[in-house]
């Protein structure tokens, strides 16, 4: 049963009671009728007025008091809000500062870690270089003590690769002078016998014209160490060698060099190009122990 239905039923009951009262015998004279007669009524009115006045005064007084309190509360709340806002603002600023500090600390830590990692790598490289230098020096000492007929390690500043030593010039010379320089170092201008060796040399010389140990001097093409040209590795640029005469310097082009892309070209042997010397390590010997 719903609440609305209960209420309706209650109203019905009240109404039926009222009907029952009217049907009964006449009631005695009501109290109000008795009170409202004559001076009693006046006194009652006065009393009620006074009471009402007192109530109004009390309520008025309480209202102003409440208003005062409300004003006070408003003021307090306003102050509290402002103070809270200021505090929140302050905290937010502090939070921002803390965040910034955190970020700064994080980046500092990151930088220090990076620096440390770089230092570590650098240290490892130095150690590696040190070990290599030590081995080289040890080998040089052994070579000096021996009769010098067999080379077991690369000279200082030479690069070892696949049992050969390579030296890369940083200045330029004519082919014949470069060839002579290498011979004085008990070496020869580089002889390229494989794609792997080509890539190694190319990596070290970069995109710079560099003489190699291949020439024809207008006879057959020959490698300076006697390696067979005809059956060996070749990496000429398209349409090369062309023994070009158009340069007007006399003769054609009789000496081979690496071009900027690593492929070979024949050129006038007098041009002052960089060069690469090569010498083979003794095949039978092993690296001497460090200690």
């Amino acid at each position: 049963m719903t609440k609305e239905y209960q209420d309706l039923q209650h109203l019905d009951n009240e109404e039926s009671d009222h009907h029952q009262l009217r049907k009964g015998p006449p009631p005695p004279q009501p109290l109000l009728q008795r009170l409202c007669s004559g001076p009693r009524l006046l006194l009652l009115s006065l009393g009620l007025s006074l009471l009402l006045l007192v109530v109004v005064c009390v309520i008025g007084s309480q209202n102003s008091q409440l208003q005062e309190e409300l004003r006070g509360l408003r003021e307090t709340f306003s102050n509290f809000t402002a103070s809270t806002e200021a505090q929140v603002k302050g905290l937010s600023t502090q939070g921002g500062n803390v965040g910034r500090k955190m970020k700064s600390l994080e980046s500092q830590l990151e930088k220090q870690q990076k620096d440390l990692s770089e230092d570590h790598s650098s240290l490892l490289l130095h150690v590696k270089q040190f070990v290599s230098d030590l081995r080289s020096l040890s080998c040089q000492m052994a070579a000096l003590q021996g009769n010098g007929s067999e080379r077991t390690c690369c000279p200082v500043n030479w690069v070892e690769h696949e049992r050969s030593c390579y030296w890369f010039s940083r200045s330029g010379k004519a082919w014949a002078d470069a060839d002579n320089y290498c011979r004085l170092e008990d070496a020869h201008l580089v002889v390229v016998t494989s794609w792997e060796e080509q890539k190694f040399v190319q990596h070290h010389i970069g995109p710079v014209n560099t003489w190699m140990g291949l020439h024809d001097q207008n006879g057959p093409w020959k490698w300076v160490d006697g390696t067979d040209y005809e059956t060996g590795f070749k990496n000429w640029r398209p349409e090369q060698p062309d023994d070009w005469y158009g340069h007007g310097l006399g003769g054609g082009e009789d000496c081979a060099h690496f071009t900027d892309d690593g492929r070979w070209n024949d050129d006038v042997c007098q041009r002052p190009y960089r060069w690469v010397c090569e010498t083979e390590l003794d095949k039978a010997s092993q690296e001497p122990p460090l200690l």
Epitope: E239, G251, G252
Partner: antibody
Framework: EVQLVESGGGLVKPGGSLRLSCAAS????????MNWVRQAPGKGLEWVSS????????YYADSVKGRFTISRDNAKNSLYLQMNSLRAEDTAVYYC????????WGQGTLVTVSS | DIQMTQSPSSLSASIGDRITLTCRAS??????LAWFQQRPGKAPKSLIY???SLLSGVPSKFSGSGSGTDFTLTISSLQPEDFATYYC?????????FGGGTKVELK
Amino acid sequence: EVQLVESGGGLVKPGGSLRLSCAASGFTFSSYRMNWVRQAPGKGLEWVSSMSNSSSSIYYADSVKGRFTISRDNAKNSLYLQMNSLRAEDTAVYYCARQAAQDYWGQGTLVTVSS
Amino acid sequence: DIQMTQSPSSLSASIGDRITLTCRASQGISNYLAWFQQRPGKAPKSLIYAASSLLSGVPSKFSGSGSGTDFTLTISSLQPEDFATYYCQQYNSFPFTFGGGTKVELK
């Protein structure tokens, strides 16, 4: 072993044409400049024409310019000389030779221009 | 064009003789000079290139020298097979030119 073998010579009337061939073997033909040299009967050697390995650089003697054309086919290891408007003075043994310094020569092929 | 002049045009010599042939260029040709030997009825054969470099397979009795305009070919000890005509050729610039030749005959 380097070998150069000429062919295509023969008897031709003045104003006629001939095409000489030179077959190369025993070396990387595509790496070398090639030449034609001729020798008139009882005379000295005369350079005729030259072509670089890639055909990019071609030269002719003044005496044959405009009449002779040198060419090569690196895939076939062959050198050619197309001779047009032949004259009596073109009669000679024609040799193909390798490199500017002519380090290797063929055995020659005889061209006779006569009416 | 560069003119090449050989001298003498002919030379008589005996077996075992040392002979020197000369070749002169009308202008400087650096070392761009070759020497050839031609026996009667045969194709020329290369002896020397770059003025002094001996071609492989050529006996060491042959030697060349010179630079610029004056060049020489020397045969240290003449043998029967050396009697032939010798030519020089410049390849400094086109057109390539040959000398007139020196005929070496048996005395």
